[in-house]
């Protein structure tokens, strides 16, 4: 019994005066607490308590469940205890089979003994299976067996407390260890689509998938720069142990323009947090925006190829596309395809392939596209660059020499005189009249230029050259002069094309 100095309050004394007492099942337990300021007896086993206000605790017929710690407390709060074992060969263990362990922490298998004199108090696997090699434990007959540093691999481990009694192994009831994992990484979050485009009144629904080791992971949908509570629905699955998946679905049944913005799926656990965002754009009606990928005014050389290319954004999806020239619709020579295979793609490409263009094929080429809400179009003005062609070269009745040439860009006509038999005509002659004539062909066709000179200016035999040229090339026509006396002979025109 404890001893204290005179004058100081002392703890109560208990009879019998020993720390442990062993009684047989069916025998009497009689414990006396002596203290002038006696308050109560408390009995505790498996962390449950009972109280008794009598100073003598009497149990006439002891049962195994009377095993436990008996504590007497006085009015000063001082106490003294005795541990009683009620030896029952039929019930060697008292148990509480609730067994939870936190990863990396210790956990107690609650199987205190009713007989401290048994041996080899330990843990055993169920059905004769061995325990994990790294499982360490510390037995305490009054409390149970402490498993040290629980591992995730021990989850759903089946255990028995075990003792040897009279040479035989005796097992307790089964314990199933349920391990709560420690978070050792942030949650993994992903979103069904990174962006959404909707018309007013359509339903917005987006799903966030959260993956972690347990359902204790926290997740929520948040609207950036807003505290508004969003309506979410959840589905969750355990794909085996420590592989938990939750799908959090956010829905706005009838989206409005002012619902547009960035929505964040946020998840956190005790290790850290992760988030992913999706962007919602709500438009009051659908749209089509066309972007030419080349200049809408196109210059191309005669006989060459050109591709007219547009990109366009269409929402909802485009329903009709066509290329038109001179009120005729192309049935081939063009292709239309989505810019990407992404589910949320709204960008498309259309290409018209014009091959070996002729000078007569210049003009306006129009791309038209429509969806259920709008129509849109874009026009390309195509000019075919052609080398000048001399249409006519004549001596007029008034003595004028006239040269008419067509080409694109507009040809320039220069005149040259070559005296005698010289091949090179270098002396330029100024025209009397130059006119650009209106072409009777389609717009964007060749431009026609007419130039005239006065033949009376020439006094000697020779050749007059009419040279028509532009950026593409040049062409010449020649007039030959022969004088007999004072009379000018017939002028013989001929042409010589030069590249």
């Amino acid at each position: 019994q404890p001893s204290v100095s005179p004058g100081e309050p002392s703890p109560p004394s208990i009879h019998p005066g020993k720390s442990d007492l062993i009684v047989r099942v069916g025998d009497e337990i009689r414990l006396l607490c002596t203290d002038p300021g006696f308050v109560k007896w408390t009995f505790e086993i498996l962390d449950e308590t009972n109280e008794n206000k009598q100073n003598e605790w009497i149990t006439e017929k002891a049962e195994a469940t009377n095993t436990g710690k008996y504590t007497c407390t006085n009015k000063h709060g001082l106490s003294n205890s005795i541990y009683v074992f009620v030896r029952d060969p039929a019930k060697l263990f008292l148990v509480d089979r609730s067994l939870y362990g936190k990863e990396d922490n210790d956990t107690l298998v609650r199987c205190p003994l009713t007989d401290p004199e048994v041996t080899n108090y330990s843990l055993k696997g169920c059905q004769g299976k061995p325990l994990p090699k790294d499982l360490r434990f510390i037995p305490d007959p009054k409390a149970g067996i402490m498993i040290k540093s629980v591992k995730r691999a021990y989850h759903r481990l089946c255990l028995h407390c075990s003792v040897d009694q009279e040479g035989k192994s005796v097992l307790s009831e089964k314990f199933i260890l349920k391990v709560r994992p420690a978070f050792k990484a942030v949650p993994v979050v992903s979103v069904s689509k990174a962006s959404y485009l909707l018309r007013e009144g359509e339903e917005f629904t987006v799903t966030c998938t959260i993956k972690d080791v347990s359902s204790s992971v926290y997740s929520t949908w948040k609207r950036e720069n807003s505290q508004t509570k969003l309506q979410e629905k959840y589905n969750s699955w355990h794909h085996g142990d420590f592989n938990y998946e939750r799908q959090a679905t956010l829905t706005i049944s009838s989206a409005r323009v002012n619902d547009s913005g960035v929505f964040m799926c946020y998840a956190n656990n005790t290790f850290g947090s992760a988030n992913v965002t999706t962007t919602l754009e709500v438009v009051d009606k659908g749209f089509i925006n066309i972007f030419p990928m080349i200049n809408t005014t196109v210059f191309v050389n005669d006989g060459e190829n050109v591709d007219l290319i547009v990109e366009y954004e269409a929402f909802p999806k485009p329903e009709h596309q066509q290329w038109i020239y001179m009120n005729r619709t192309f049935t081939d020579k063009w292709e239309d395809y989505p810019k990407s295979e992404n589910e949320s793609n709204i960008r498309y490409v259309s290409e018209l392939h014009l091959t070996r263009l002729k000078g007569t094929e210049g003009g306006t080429y129009t791309f038209l596209v429509s969806n259920s809400d709008v129509n849109a179009a874009i026009a390309f003005n195509v000019y075919v660059n052609t080398k000048p062609e001399i249409l006519t070269y004549d001596r007029l009745v008034n003595g004028m020499l006239q040269c008419v040439a067509a080409g694109f860009p507009e040809p320039t006509i220069d005149w040259y005189f070559c005296p005698g038999t010289e091949q090179r005509c270098s002396a330029s002659v100024l025209p009397v009249d130059v006119q650009t004539l209106n072409s009777s062909g389609p717009p964007f066709g060749k431009l026609v230029v007419q130039s005239s000179i006065d033949s009376s200016a020439f006094k000697h035999n020779g050749t007059v050259e009419c040279k028509a040229y532009n950026d593409v090339g040049k062409t010449s026509a020649y007039f030959n002069f022969a004088f007999k006396g004072n009379n000018k002979e017939q002028i013989h025109p001929h042409t010589l094309f030069t590249p």
């Epitope: 505790e44 962390d47 936190k102 922490n105 709560r180 359902s215």
Partner: antibody
């Protein structure tokens, strides 16, 4: 003699929060898990979550995720359950229940929470 | 989550009758042959009271006319001879897997 004594009935407005207490006696408070279960009028029982013994870890039913918080005060052997953003659907009797030997062997008397505008 | 479906949802019986209530789980609640299934009784305005734990164990203080059986996904609560105080609502509950779940209840009424 294990006892769980809960706080009294509460009337709350939609959007408010409620915090129900559950004072335990007759056992070592830190040695047992405490669960919370609710029952709407005329309906069945619904598990809300658990606060584990020892370190205060929690596990919540995802239905209440983000709205519920379970805590304990070991100095007074009291468990608490707070539910936020209340709606009329949260009108129910809320019970605390101690888990012992795998089952809910002890229950509080229940706390009626009425959510009404 | 594990869904528990009780049948019947309600039942009329007389004092002295033998009554059986079944509870079917959407997946097994067993681990190593231990069934994490429990049965509770609830009377109006009262907290639930544990009757049977781990499928077949009678809780201390509960009359022996109550018994439980079953394993895996199918479980049964039997009352061998109904007494007047047994008219109440009965719930099965599993705690094999989080979230713990209850059956929808079986209301036992006097015929």
């Amino acid at each position: 003699q294990v006892q769980l004594v809960q706080s009294g009935a509460e009337v709350k407005k939609p959007g408010a929060s409620v915090k129900v207490s559950c004072k335990a006696s007759g056992y070592t408070f830190t040695s047992y898990n405490m669960h919370w279960v609710r029952q709407a009028p005329g309906q069945g029982l619904e598990w809300m979550g658990v606060i584990y013994s020892g370190n205060g870890d929690t596990s919540y039913n995802q239905k209440f995720k983000g709205r519920v918080t379970m805590t304990t005060d070991t100095s007074t052997s009291t468990a608490y359950m707070e539910l936020r953003s209340l709606t009329s659907d949260d009108t129910a009797v809320y019970y605390c229940a101690r888990e012992r030997d795998t089952r809910f062997g002890n229950w509080g008397q229940g706390t009626l929470v009425t959510v009404s505008a | 989550e594990i869904v528990l479906t009780q049948s019947p949802s309600s039942l009329s019986a007389s004092v002295g009758d033998r009554v059986t209530i079944t509870c079917r789980a959407s997946e097994s609640v067993d681990i190593y042959g231990q069934s994490f299934m429990h049965w509770y009784q609830q009377k109006p305005g009262k907290a639930p009271k544990l009757l049977i734990y781990l499928a077949s164990n009678l809780e201390s203080g509960v009359p022996s006319r109550f018994s439980g059986s079953g394993s895996g996904t199918d479980f049964t609560l039997t009352i061998s001879s109904l007494q007047p105080e047994d008219f109440a609502t009965y719930y099965c509950q599993q705690n094999n897997e989080d979230p713990y779940t209850f059956g929808q209840g079986t209301k036992l009424e006097i015929k």
